[in-house]
């Protein structure tokens, strides 16, 4: 389906202002995507952690399609897509459905095809080439090897898209080897490897300033050269910076 | 701190259906837990019944709740329920609800839960 023309007065659902939830919030220009390992190796209950995970890194990204927009994909022997980039939703209503993600607890969860999906199917079409474009890659399973012949294909040619792909690596049967290989690609490509999902909370907020440092800021309105500019004081507005990069709003 | 309380316990007969709920005093903070269920029979240890995840999607259960027992959770209302059918005498014992942090994986660990309610006495005649 083609989007509707918009007009400037068009306002979104997603545009009525909902109040940050965290003292650490990022407004950058981010297109960030969420694939979730749904085999078996993780239990039902880990699974819903990997959700929490989830829903809680959202909480921290100022989510809107001007700032950051968000895809969510639970993957197994194939893809699901619960939200996608495009999706004009409120943010507390993208949670929810983040949170509804299904456990699959299949057999096989291929790293392979999920790569492949973002490349021709998220990424087909780079709309936002102003802003960064992360995946953030949940993996606690090895997919079987005929499955994963063209896995640095799709790595390589998410990297001609600079799509940066960002691995965690959870429990002992993550597959360290395709880890190390999306590493090697870029150096932007950390890898995040964690013991089991109850390494996810502690890892939480290392991850999601990782990912905000590698999007741009907004660059600022241009104004007519006879226009007077107003600034609002940091107190006013209630943001602070956190850092070089990445902004913060105190509650 | 979340504060839980339990209520609807009674004396049913055997063969008969009863509805536990459990509420919690802070919205905010009940979407963020596990709800588990546990019951301790009279000079029994406390034993696992069943847990419903902090989305609501998932479920487990111990092996004598299986078919007979149900668990459910409505956000709005802040309240987890119990819904337990067919009862047998041996399901006669105080039942507690508890909330576990939504990191948290190993929902049947007594010890990794935070809070607990009061417990409510099912007492099933035979």
């Known amino acids: 389906p083609t989007d509707a023309p918009v007009s400037p007065t068009t306002l979104y659902v997603e545009d009525i202002s909902e109040p940050p939830l965290h003292d650490f919030y990022c407004s950058r220009l981010l297109d960030l995507v969420f694939l979730l390992d749904g085999s078996s190796r993780l239990s039902e209950a880990e699974f819903e952690v990997l959700k929490a995970f989830v829903v809680d890194m959202m909480e921290r990204l100022r989510i809107s399609q001007k700032w950051v927009r968000v895809a969510v994909v639970e993957y197994h022997d194939g893809s699901h897509a619960y939200i996608g980039l495009k999706d004009r939703k409120r943010p507390s209503e993208l949670r929810r459905i983040a949170s509804q993600v299904k456990y699959a607890g299949s057999q096989v969860a291929s790293t392979s095809e999920v790569l492949k999906y973002t490349l021709f199917q998220i990424f087909s079409k780079i709309d936002r080439p102003e802003a960064s474009r992360i995946t953030l890659l949940l993996m606690a399973s090895q997919e079987p090897q005929r499955m994963s012949r063209n896995f640095v294909r799709y790595v390589q040619g998410l990297k001609k898209k600079k799509v940066i792909v960002i691995p965690v690596g959870i429990g002992p049967h993550a597959n360290l080897k395709q880890i190390r290989l999306i590493e090697k690609q870029a150096p932007e490509n950390k890898a995040f490897v964690l013991s089991s999902v109850d390494e996810l909370e502690q890892q939480r907020d290392e991850i999601v300033s990782y990912l905000c440092d590698l999007a741009p800021e907004a660059p600022p309105p241009t104004l007519p050269p006879d226009m007077a500019q107003v600034t609002v004081g940091p107190g006013l507005l209630g943001v602070s910076t956190l850092g070089p990069k990445r902004n913060s709003m105190v509650l | 701190a979340v504060q839980l309380v339990d209520s609807g316990g009674g004396l049913v007969q055997a063969g008969g259906s009863l509805r536990l709920s459990c509420t919690a005093s802070?919205?905010?903070?009940?979407?963020?837990?596990?709800l588990g269920w546990f019951r301790q029979a009279p000079g029994k240890e406390r034993e696992f019944v069943g847990g419903?995840?902090?989305?609501?999607?998932?479920?487990d259960y111990a092996e004598f709740a299986k078919g007979r027992f149900t668990i459910s959770r409505d956000h709005a209302a802040n309240t987890v329920y119990l819904e337990m059918n067919s009862l047998k005498p041996e399901d006669t014992a105080v039942y507690y609800c508890?909330?576990?942090?939504?990191?948290?994986?190993?929902?049947?660990?007594?010890?990794?839960?935070?809070?607990w309610g009061q417990g409510t006495q099912v007492t099933v005649s035979s």
């Open positions: 802070e919205r905010t903070t009940f979407s963020s837990y596990t």
């Open positions: 508890a909330a576990l942090g939504r990191y948290r994986s190993n929902w049947r660990n007594i010890g990794q839960y935070d809070y």
């Open positions: 419903i995840s902090w989305s609501g999607v998932s479920t």
